[in-house]
Interface confidence: low
């Protein structure tokens, strides 16, 4: 009956911890005889190929100093410790503490035996380390030009991390790799970059971070700070006011960010009827007259710029009885 | 032992707003994005959408709109916003761990009819 | 959208191996889990991340993947294995986040 070496093909370790290589013989043959079981890189120098042995009365051996005994441990092979004992060496599961970079690459275990001589299997082991993930918006000021809006930055990953981002703006994502202060490491940071405008300010978007090491991807929201000159619109008219009417304002209506320091009111014209009050963001009128047949101006300013808005008022002689709202406000 | 649990499923008439709330055992809500899906009568399994860690909502293109997620420390809630007769359904709230599903809990029956 | 296609019904004699496939019409970066229905019950995950068998699971159920069809393989299939089965998959694109269910395949065993 054939025997084999049942490996995994890969197996993962963290960065710093300890991981387990399982090796076994298999099936279990009465009366075969297992001489060795031994633990190889096959890609290493020569001299550091034979990482660990183990012999069925003498017991484990490491050879190599990397990674060195301190650092290696069988699981669960046992030797013979007299005439009544037999030696296990079916399981040559191998373990490896406090693992570094340099750890990663092809382990074979072997073994010889009789009479079917030596049968061995491969396992790759690959080092990983969890990267630590953070995101924050950067405060940007309004232009026509592409701008870093938020950054997402996940660091000392093994391998890199995958960032990608989850919004409905209009977006690209620029991204750089530098090594991280833990040898083997990357630190990804992608830059979530569009032309900012008042239309992003407080938008949540979401940093979404994929890594080996996460049971599930990471996501991370972040709200956007965008400071904009004021958006201005003015509401309160109603294609209604007539000469003499006394319950008519005008409001000028404001996004901006930060907010406004100041409201202006004017009218294109120049003249500015004696009856129109401007109170803050508010142009309330005690009575009309035909001095507002006229296009009355809101300018807001802010720490950012300036925006205004402009309404065109039409004076009636008389009320407009025709399905007019009541809307002057 | 981890369990999740659905509740406020009922009759209700179209355009009567339902909520559903999902209740956790043996582990925190808090710590888990949480999912809904839903089973109508002899389909199979549709998910709505799903609430993260951070307490953003991401919903299935058909199913903006018409539902909200939200949760607090201890529940997760569905909302649907004006139930139609095609919304009949078993509603299902899971743990989303990993690249799937990996904690259900029993289902609630959701009946919409005039 | 994306979709994932399924077998409506699949036929498998007890004792016998069958392979169950989820074909999505894109390719997806994204990886493929498995869910066991049985009438009046939840799902329960059986497969994630194409390969990955949850603790409690019998190693009778095993995924695969290549191309855009992950396959569930139940070995060995038992009585007990009557069910639905969905296989779903993230949709993640660059402005949107959602799963996707495929349409399940109600698998009877004979004999």
């Known amino acids: 009956q054939d025997v084999r070496v049942q490996v995994l093909p890969e197996v993962r370790g963290q960065l710093g911890g300890t991981v387990e290589l399982p090796c076994h013989l298999l099936p279990p043959v009465p009366g075969l005889y297992i001489s060795l079981v031994t633990w190889q890189r096959p890609d290493a120098p020569a001299n550091h190929q034979n990482v660990a042995a183990f012999h069925p009365k003498m017991g484990p051996s490491f050879p190599s100093p990397k990674p060195g005994s301190e650092r290696l441990s069988f699981v669960s092979a046992k030797q013979s410790t007299g005439q009544d004992t037999e030696a296990e060496l079916q399981d040559a599961t191998l373990a490896l503490h406090g693992l570094t970079v340099e750890d990663e690459g092809n382990y074979t275990c072997e073994f010889a035996t009789f009479p079917k001589g030596s049968v061995r299997g491969m396992t790759w082991l690959r080092v990983i380390a969890k990267p630590k993930n953070q995101a924050e918006a950067q405060k940007v000021t309004f232009s026509q030009d592409p701008t870093t809006v938020a950054l997402c930055i996940s660091k000392e990953g093994r391998p890199p991390a995958r960032i990608s981002w989850l919004s409905s703006l209009d977006w690209e994502a620029k991204e750089t790799q530098v090594s991280g202060t833990l040898a083997g490491t990357v630190t990804v940071t992608s830059r979530f970059t569009l032309v900012p405008s008042g239309r992003a300010d407080g938008v949540t978007v979401t940093c979404k971070v994929e890594h080996e090491s996460f049971e599930e991807p990471a996501l991370i929201p972040v709200t956007l700070s965008v400071r904009y000159p004021p958006e201005v619109s003015i509401s309160g008219y109603d294609d209604n006011w007539y000469l003499g009417r006394t319950d008519a304002t005008l409001s000028c209506d404001v996004r901006s960010n930060p907010e406004p320091t100041g409201y202006d009111w004017s009218t294109t014209s120049g003249t500015f009827p004696t009856s129109a009050v401007a109170q803050g963001s508010q142009l309330v009128i005690h009575a009309v007259d035909s001095l507002f047949n006229t296009t009355f101006v809101c300018t807001v300013t802010n720490a950012v710029g300036m925006g205004r808005a402009e309404q065109v008022i039409f004076v009636r002689e008389t009320p407009n009885t025709a399905g007019a709202g009541a809307t002057g406000g | 032992q981890e369990q999740l649990e659905e509740s406020g499923g009922r009759l209700v008439t179209p355009g009567t707003p339902l909520t559903l709330t999902c209740t956790a055992s043996?582990?925190?809500?808090?710590?888990?994005?949480m999912s809904w899906v839903r089973q109508a009568p002899g389909k199979g399994l549709e998910w709505i959408g799903l609430?993260?860690?951070?307490?953003s909502a991401y919903y299935a293109s058909w199913a903006k709109g018409r539902f909200t997620i939200s949760r607090t420390s201890t529940t997760v809630d569905l909302r649907i916003t004006s139930p139609t007769t095609e919304d009949t359904a078993t509603y299902f709230c899971?743990?989303?761990f990993g690249d799937g599903f990996n904690l259900w809990g029993p289902g609630t029956l959701v009946t919409i009819s005039s | 959208s994306f979709v994932l296609t399924q077998p409506a019904s699949v036929q498998v004699d007890l004792g016998q191996t069958v392979s169950l496939t989820c074909t999505a019409d894109t390719l997806s970066r994204s990886y493929a889990s498995w869910y066991q229905q049985k009438p009046g019950q939840a799902p329960v995950l059986l497969i994630y991340r194409d390969t990955s068998r949850p603790s409690g699971v019998p190693d009778r159920f095993s995924g695969s993947s290549s191309g855009n069809t992950a396959t569930l393989t139940i070995s060995g299939a038992q009585a007990g294995d009557e069910a639905d089965y969905y296989c779903a998959t993230e949709d993640s694109g660059d402005s949107s986040y959602q799963y996707v269910f495929g349409g399940g395949t109600q698998l009877t065993v004979t004999g």
């Open positions: 609430i993260n860690t951070g307490d």
């Open positions: 043996g582990f925190s809500l808090s710590s888990y994005h």
């Open positions: 899971a743990r989303t």
